[in-house]
């Protein structure tokens, strides 16, 4: 399925690109999937379509939903879906996992942190950068074009980095923020922090009601002795053993170590006889060691039994 997850904060600009690509000369029509209502192209609207792009200037929580884009050429149509979620601004400093873009790793030699999605926006330098909500100060930090460079990277530089910039549309300015985690690699080039390879962050797993389903939480841990290295599942923030649902169990899967000292662990979550209420739960894959904790969240969605394309 040509579907893409996009997210943003209320009262900020959000620009989404159609997951189906086409030549610039092709027309692209956008619809709000729930109502099949066409998205206008006039720029005076708060939400409008501009070719491959769908613009929320600014975004509102009520804009959340699935948007359909149809790329039309003289010989074919291609359909894509943008799953947009707009969240309320957090009052505290914490950036929740669901607002995080992909984690990047750096080492002493290479420590660029790119500002996610910035290429979609009409912005001008300089970018503002924050670490764990604190504005970055000091000569070690250099904002350059669309990325941050950190000189003489240390383990303590790991954390959540937020870029803030202004999008300009017809003379009006809109704020945009985006956050991603930065991890510091060891000399072998692998993160000292746990790295989760599966599931993907915010993955939607399709399941059939009444059938069994398996979810695998798989992570690798950096070189060296791992006194504490664990991979586990949580349901709605609760350990499986404490959740008290006998249909849902976790068991250790494949463990493997590699020639560079990397150790990887799997934990399989088995759900027997999937029920409707299972779709309402939040499934968290957790990987932790002495350097920190990583969490990837999965949700289940109902698979149409006759849908053989997914």
């Amino acid at each position: 399925k040509f579907s893409k997850q996009s997210w943003g904060l209320e009262n900020e600009a959000l620009i989404v690109r159609c997951p189906r690509q086409g030549k610039p000369s092709y027309t692209v029509d956008w619809y709000y999937s729930q109502t099949n209502k066409s998205i206008p192209t006039q720029e005076r609207n708060r939400v409008f379509a501009s070719g491959q792009l769908l613009k929320f200037l600014p975004a509102a929580v009520a804009d959340s939903g699935i948007y359909t884009c149809i790329v039309r050429s003289p010989t074919f149509n291609r359909t894509g879906y943008a799953n947009v979620t707009i969240y309320k601004k957090q009052s505290d400093c914490n950036v929740p996992d669901y607002l995080m873009y992909s984690t990047v790793s750096g080492s002493e030699k290479n420590s660029k942190i790119y500002c996610p999605t910035i290429d979609l926006y009409n912005w001008t330098a300089p970018l503002e950068w924050f670490k764990n909500c604190q504005a970055l100060q000091g000569s070690r930090y250099r904002a350059h074009k669309s990325f941050l460079v950190i000189d003489n990277v240390m383990t303590e530089d790991a954390g959540d980095y937020t870029c803030k910039f202004i999008h300009n549309e017809n003379g009006a300015n809109y704020s945009v923020t985006a956050t991603r985690s930065f991890t510091v690699k060891d000399e072998q080039g692998f993160s000292l922090f746990p790295v989760i390879g599966a599931p993907a962050q915010n993955e939607i797993k399709e399941v059939e009601i009444g059938k069994n389903a398996n979810l695998t939480c798989s992570a690798c841990f950096g070189k060296g002795t791992q006194f504490l290295a664990a991979v586990l599942w949580q349901l709605n923030g609760t350990k499986i053993t404490d959740f008290g649902e006998p249909r849902i169990q976790q068991e250790e899967g494949q463990n493997q170590s590699f020639s560079n000292g990397l150790a990887c662990l799997d934990m399989v979550l088995r759900i027997a006889d999937v029920k409707e209420e299972d779709l309402l739960l939040q499934y968290d894959c957790l990987a932790l060691n002495l350097h920190g904790l990583r969490r990837h969240t999965v949700r289940l969605s109902r698979k149409n039994p006759i849908d053989h394309h997914s």
Partner: nanobody, 118 residues
């Protein structure tokens, strides 16, 4: 995949895996092997940065490489042992975070059989 077959212990084989239909700048490709009744075991992986990782059992005998122009992944296997006998699979994922762990991979080839006799 192609390049599998039968070989005497100590011999060599080169496996190839031709990928089509992807144009991703960030990716991870891997080789895995499976013997009857056992799970898939990670042999080697390579990502879009060229970083390689090998299973502990490889011990310098195998080399993973790619030819970007041909969209082809290779596994050069030297000093083969009878215990290397297995079905070998190539796999891919659209992310440069990379390790040869089967659960990380989305796209799988059909497999090619390698048999090493003593």
């Amino acid at each position: 995949e192609s390049g599998g077959g039968s070989v005497q212990a100590g011999g060599s084989l080169r496996l190839s895996c031709a990928a089509s239909g992807y144009t991703y700048s960030r990716y991870c490709m891997g080789w895995f092997r499976q013997t009857p009744g056992k799970g898939r075991e990670g042999v080697a992986s390579i990502n879009s940065d060229g970083t390689t990782i090998y299973g502990n059992f490889v011990k310098g005998r195998f080399t993973i490489s790619e030819d970007n122009a041909k969209n082809t992944l290779y596994l050069q296997m030297n000093s083969l042992k009878p215990e290397d006998t297995a079905m070998y699979y190539c796999a891919a994922r659209v992310d440069s975070t990379c390790a040869p762990m089967p659960s990380w991979f989305t796209y799988w080839g059909q497999g090619t059989q390698v048999t090493v006799s003593s």
